[in-house]
């Protein structure tokens, strides 16, 4: 969390951001909070991006004002108009790029004073991955897939029974790049597995956080998954 | 239609804390700001804030602040107000109110509750 | 703050008659960009929570009779009720939302003769 004032002029207005991560080719929110005006007409946002001369989006007197808006993010940006008015200045960014990465500045101004506050905005590729089990193989084998990750991540077997223990040796992981060319699709193979016991496929790196369960009973097989940005710090 | 219905009155000692709920239906309670305001024969009608239950922003006037806490849970469609460190200053009617259908101001207030009378005495 | 003054603090009038009780804003309320005005009147019935008349200073609220006239710009205000009806018995509050924090005048008491 950041969090900024204005030091120009008399007054300030506290401005908060949250550092976060976007997925490519996927939609994003850089998060902005500032102390609301009673006019929607007395807010002005500015979104600015370290390193790129024109703005990155500008909303002013209650409508968007793209005019000096840069050539690479023709399109793809928007703030929650409807939400202006409650203080929220976050910024919706559409089909991000790998190249959208960086610092952006979330500048306000209203009828009280100005404020401003600095975000890192990480890009890359994240998915939950799907634990199966693997009936093609002549043992008993575990299949962890996550379609889509950037950069190339790590990947760790756990077990519940076995805590601590090592299956880098039982284990085979590969990553095979998409069509696209800059994600890959993430694969790993747990071998000699044991029934009545729980899995878990951790996928990392340094934007995202995934884990995949599988736990296998004699009468059942129950998967579980989640995902976790690593960077959600607020300024 | 919309409605806002506000807890009953309440009788507490000087220094304690208060509670004040204020139940909306009728309309999407994620979309509109909820108010709080205290009506006292001295001092008349007074904004305390809103609060925003989409995202859980609030504003407060100064007067309020540390006085006043805002909360709001979505899934009940419900609005609190905490009150602190109660003295007699505090006894009054407290309401609850909808902000407008404008984006471009959270007022005037159409929907008001019918109002929560709060006494402080030993 | 804004200070709302409003005047007189209370009248009797007749059931039919006209009347006017007026707000006066210690700033303007007129806002140069949308040329709106941010005042609204409320009328408080005795006993019941406040209800909206007029906002913009001269735009009726849903249902409102048209016997509420709201006038005025800048710093004065104006409510009308053009023939006043025995269940206008109530107080009436202007408000302004121009700036934080938004506030209230002190209220005309309205009373039937």
């Known amino acids: 969390l950041i969090i900024g004032f204005g030091i120009s002029g008399r007054h300030s207005i506290t401005v908060t951001t949250v550092a976060s991560a976007g997925n490519i080719g996927e939609d994003g929110i850089l998060s902005c909070t500032f102390e609301p005006d009673i006019k929607l007409s007395d807010i002005v946002i500015q979104w600015l991006k370290e390193g790129v001369l024109g703005l990155v989006h500008e909303f002013k007197e209650g409508k968007d004002e793209l005019s000096e808006q840069d050539e690479m993010f023709r399109g793809r940006t928007a703030v929650f108009a409807d939400q202006v008015i409650v203080g929220n200045a976050s910024l919706r960014l559409k089909n991000v790029q790998l190249t959208d990465a960086g610092t952006y500045k979330c500048y306000i101004i209203t009828s009280k004073g100005k404020g401003n506050a600095n975000l890192e905005y990480k890009t890359g590729a994240f998915s939950m991955p799907e634990v199966n089990v693997d009936y093609n193989a002549s043992s008993e084998t575990l299949r962890c897939e996550a379609p889509r990750w950037f950069p190339q991540p790590t990947v760790v077997w756990a077990s519940q029974v076995d805590q601590g223990a090592n299956f880098s040796e039982v284990s085979n992981t590969s990553f095979e790049l998409n069509s696209e060319n800059v994600t890959m699709k993430v694969v790993s193979v747990l071998y000699n597995v044991t029934i009545n016991n729980t899995y878990s496929c951790m996928i990392e790196n340094d934007i995202a956080k995934a884990t995949g369960d599988i736990k296998v009973t004699e009468s059942e097989i129950k998967r579980r998954s989640h995902l976790q940005l690593l960077n959600s710090k607020a300024s | 239609q919309v409605q806002l219905q506000e807890s009953g009155p309440e009788l507490v000692k000087p220094g304690a804390s208060v509670k004040l709920s204020c139940k909306a239906s009728g309309y999407i309670f994620t979309d509109y700001t909820i108010h709080w305001l205290k009506q006292s024969p001295g001092q008349g009608l007074e904004w305390i804030g809103w609060?925003?239950?989409?995202?859980?922003?609030?504003h407060y006037n100064d007067k309020f602040k540390g006085k006043a806490t805002m909360t709001a849970d979505k899934s009940s469609t419900t609005a609190y107000m905490q009150l602190s460190s109660l003295t007699s200053e505090d006894s009054a009617v407290f309401f609850c109110?909808?902000?407008?259908?404008?984006?471009?101001?959270?007022?005037?207030?159409?929907?008001w509750g019918q109002g929560t009378l709060v006494t402080v005495s030993a | 703050d804004i200070v709302m003054s409003q005047s007189p603090s209370s009248l009797a009038v007749s059931v039919g008659e006209k009347v006017t009780m007026s707000c006066k804003s210690s700033q303007s309320l007129l806002y140069s960009s949308d040329q709106k005005n941010y005042l609204a009147w409320y009328q408080q019935k005795p006993g019941q929570s406040p209800k909206l008349l007029i906002y913009?200073?001269?735009t009726w609220e849903s249902g409102v009779p048209d016997r509420f006239i709201g006038s005025g710009s800048g710093t004065d205000f104006t409510l009308t009720v053009s023939s006043v009806k025995a269940e206008d018995l109530a107080v009436y509050y202007c408000h302004q939302y121009y700036s934080y924090p938004p506030t209230f005048g002190a209220g005309t008491k309205l009373e039937i003769k």
């Open positions: 913009w200073a001269s």
């Open positions: 609060i925003y239950p989409g995202s859980g922003h609030t």
């Open positions: 109110a909808r902000g407008g259908e404008s984006i471009t101001t959270v007022f005037p207030l159409a929907y």
